[in-house]
């Protein structure tokens, strides 16, 4: 009899068998019948081992071994063994942020009887591989719960029968798609032509971000460093060298593994600052013994729309005015508390029209006509007085909360023209005639 038939190794087309027989008689001939669904064939050997060749991959073979000595046949013994399936090939992967759909091919005749074992391993984390086994004959699988923007390796073994696997797996590296940034916020930087962008890191891994800033024909593309989504930190970057009070289209794209996510877009407007001081000074002309006419051009709106103008008069030295003068009124002047005061306030938005950057408006103010604008009284001027005029332009005008109607110079965004040349008022004609 033959016993302990042992399959030493098996490949796709070969099988090496050995066995034992009860006595050591060397004159035994062993007859083998090799049967599969493709048919059967016979072979003999004097050895207690044989290598069967030319087999078909993934096929179940029944091997019956019968000993014979001097034409006397002993009891046969059998074993059943599959050859290994061929390795899978042509692995194709399509991904989204958290899943990968894999498909592959196996060209064996027996492939309709194969199932496939997939091992999915995140790069640098071999201890935590995911295993998926397909149904018989299925050559695709979707793996879910993956991490966005991350690198994975998949190994695919074909298997048949009771877990007889292909010798080598088909291997493929792939990356999941990076996750887009959910959104980002823009903050203006006070008195700076800049924007601060803030975001929380998108889930998964990233190599960095592409930042695109665009306004009209101007654009700028730059890279941003990578971030980590693990601790929910808020990330920020400052975009500088912009223009004041300008709308910008901003796009941020996550990058990982050489892949780019869908861009996240926002439209943001930069802040304002003090207007650029005008080159010229106002034009002042005497109208009567107690009034003058002040003419000036609107300030340039490149640092933000001009919200208001204040006409300032002084009888003193014409130094460069500061925001401090904005607190003085006609009453202060009359009391001798200041030789400089605000006589008139113009709120430009009351004109009901927007001013473009290049459009320069002309203003003509009658000073001394006893009108009142907010907390400022446009009182009569002193006959024979010598007056100079200056104009303050505001991109942001703030009023004292406790001093109703008076400008808070420190909190406002303001710049000043130079003082005009002095104009001397004539004598009051009533005094001459008197």
């Amino acid at each position: 009899a033959v016993f302990d038939i042992h399959v030493v190794y098996v490949t796709t087309t070969e099988m090496w068998l050995d066995w034992k027989s009860p006595d050591g008689a060397s004159e035994y001939v062993y007859h083998l019948v090799i049967e599969s669904k493709h048919g059967s064939n016979h072979t003999s050997t004097y050895d207690k081992a044989i290598t069967l060749q030319g087999l078909i991959p993934g096929t179940l073979y029944n091997i019956t071994i019968s000993p014979e000595v001097d034409h006397v046949w002993g009891d046969p013994n059998s074993t059943a063994q599959y050859t290994r399936p061929s390795n899978v090939s042509n692995i194709d992967v399509s991904t989204n942020t958290t899943a990968a759909t894999l498909s592959w091919q196996n060209f064996d005749d027996a492939s309709p009887t194969y199932s496939y074992c997939l091992l999915i391993e995140k790069a640098g984390n071999s201890s935590n591989a995911t295993q998926v086994v397909t149904d018989i004959g299925i050559t695709d699988a979707t793996v879910t719960e993956l991490i966005p923007g991350s690198s994975y390796t998949v190994e695919i073994f074909a298997q048949v029968g009771d877990g007889i696997k292909s010798l080598e797996p088909g291997r493929k590296s792939f990356c999941t798609d990076p996750a887009s940034m959910a959104s980002f916020d823009c903050e203006v930087v006070p008195k700076e032509p800049a924007l601060v962008l803030k975001w929380t890191c998108p889930p998964g891994a990233n190599a960095g971000f592409e930042l695109e800033v665009s306004s009209g024909a101007w654009n700028n593309a730059t890279h941003l460093e990578s971030c980590s989504s693990e601790n929910g930190t808020e990330y920020r970057t400052e975009v500088t060298y912009l223009n004041f009070s300008t709308s910008y289209n901003i796009s941020i794209t996550t990058v990982s593994c050489g892949k780019m996510a869908a861009p996240t877009r926002n439209t943001c407007t930069t802040g304002i600052t003090d207007p650029p001081p005008p080159d010229g000074s106002p034009n002042i002309t005497s109208v009567s013994h107690n009034s003058v006419k002040v003419k000036f051009s609107g300030f340039e709106a490149s640092h933000g729309p001009i919200k208001a103008y204040a006409v300032i008069l002084t009888t003193g030295e014409a130094g460069h005015p500061s925001a401090d003068v904005l607190k003085y009124t006609y009453e202060d002047f009359k009391k001798g508390a200041s030789d400089t005061y605000v006589t008139y306030l113009i709120r430009t938005e009351e004109k009901g029209r927007s001013q473009s950057l290049s459009e320069v408006l002309k203003y003509e103010i009658d000073v001394g006509n006893e009108s009142t604008t907010l907390g400022y009284y446009n009182g009569k001027l002193e006959p024979l007085g010598s007056y100079r005029a200056c104009v303050a332009g505001f991109t942001n005008i703030t009023f004292h909360p406790q001093n109703k109607g008076l400008i808070d110079g420190a909190e406002s965004y303001v710049s000043f023209s130079r003082y005009s040349d002095a104009v001397s008022l004539p004598q009051d004609p009533g005094v001459i005639c008197g």
Epitope: S214, N219, A221, H223, N249, S251, T253, G258, K259, A262
Partner: antibody, heavy 117, light 107 residues
Framework: EVKLVESGGGLVQPGRSLKLSCAAS????????MAWVRQAPTKGLEWVAY????????YYRDSVKGRFTISRDNAKSTLYLQMDSLRSEDTATYYC??????????WGQGTLVTVSS | DIQMTQTPHSLSASLGETVSIECLAS??????LAWYQQKPGKSPQLLIS???PLHDGVPSRFSGSGSGTQFSLKIRNMQPEDEGVYYC?????????FGAGTKLELT
Amino acid sequence: EVKLVESGGGLVQPGRSLKLSCAASGFTFSNYYMAWVRQAPTKGLEWVAYITNGFGSTYYRDSVKGRFTISRDNAKSTLYLQMDSLRSEDTATYYCSTVPLGAFVSWGQGTLVTVSS
Amino acid sequence: DIQMTQTPHSLSASLGETVSIECLASEGISNYLAWYQQKPGKSPQLLISYANPLHDGVPSRFSGSGSGTQFSLKIRNMQPEDEGVYYCQQGYKFPYTFGAGTKLELT
């Protein structure tokens, strides 16, 4: 699998125009920054032009500025390079490429442009 | 423009040897450096981006290092298929610029 296929190259006289195309497949074309890179015969590589994904902003090397125009049609997943006023020094194989974070990741097979009278 | 100086211009190595190619940027480029391999008549292929991450499918015998202005590409256990021209490239600032290339041959 990312696939980029350039076309439109050929022999052209100096001063004339040529339009190259790059058909993209296997990825979401509209998400990607794209570029053209060229290589003169037996020479090194030279970046030519670049276009962003968000607002289609464009950038060019100085020697082609004003003569070349990069554009994209996201609906057709196609990148273009319009080359006007061609010069003999523009003779090269032109490749299109995806460009995340300044690295030319995926390349086409290239199309040869020969500028000669 | 940022100049990328690659050394050596050419080198030959025997099977199994380790080779190094250096790249020097004329100004700091953070880690925005990529390495490419080009074989005759073929398109360049990305090997390494952002100074050290290996691109998908590139054998692990390739490695990159460096940041700022000095970078290097190391190929351990030289194989016949590693023959070709290697280029470094900065993607930090326009115009993006390449090194002149290093021709690697098998001895």
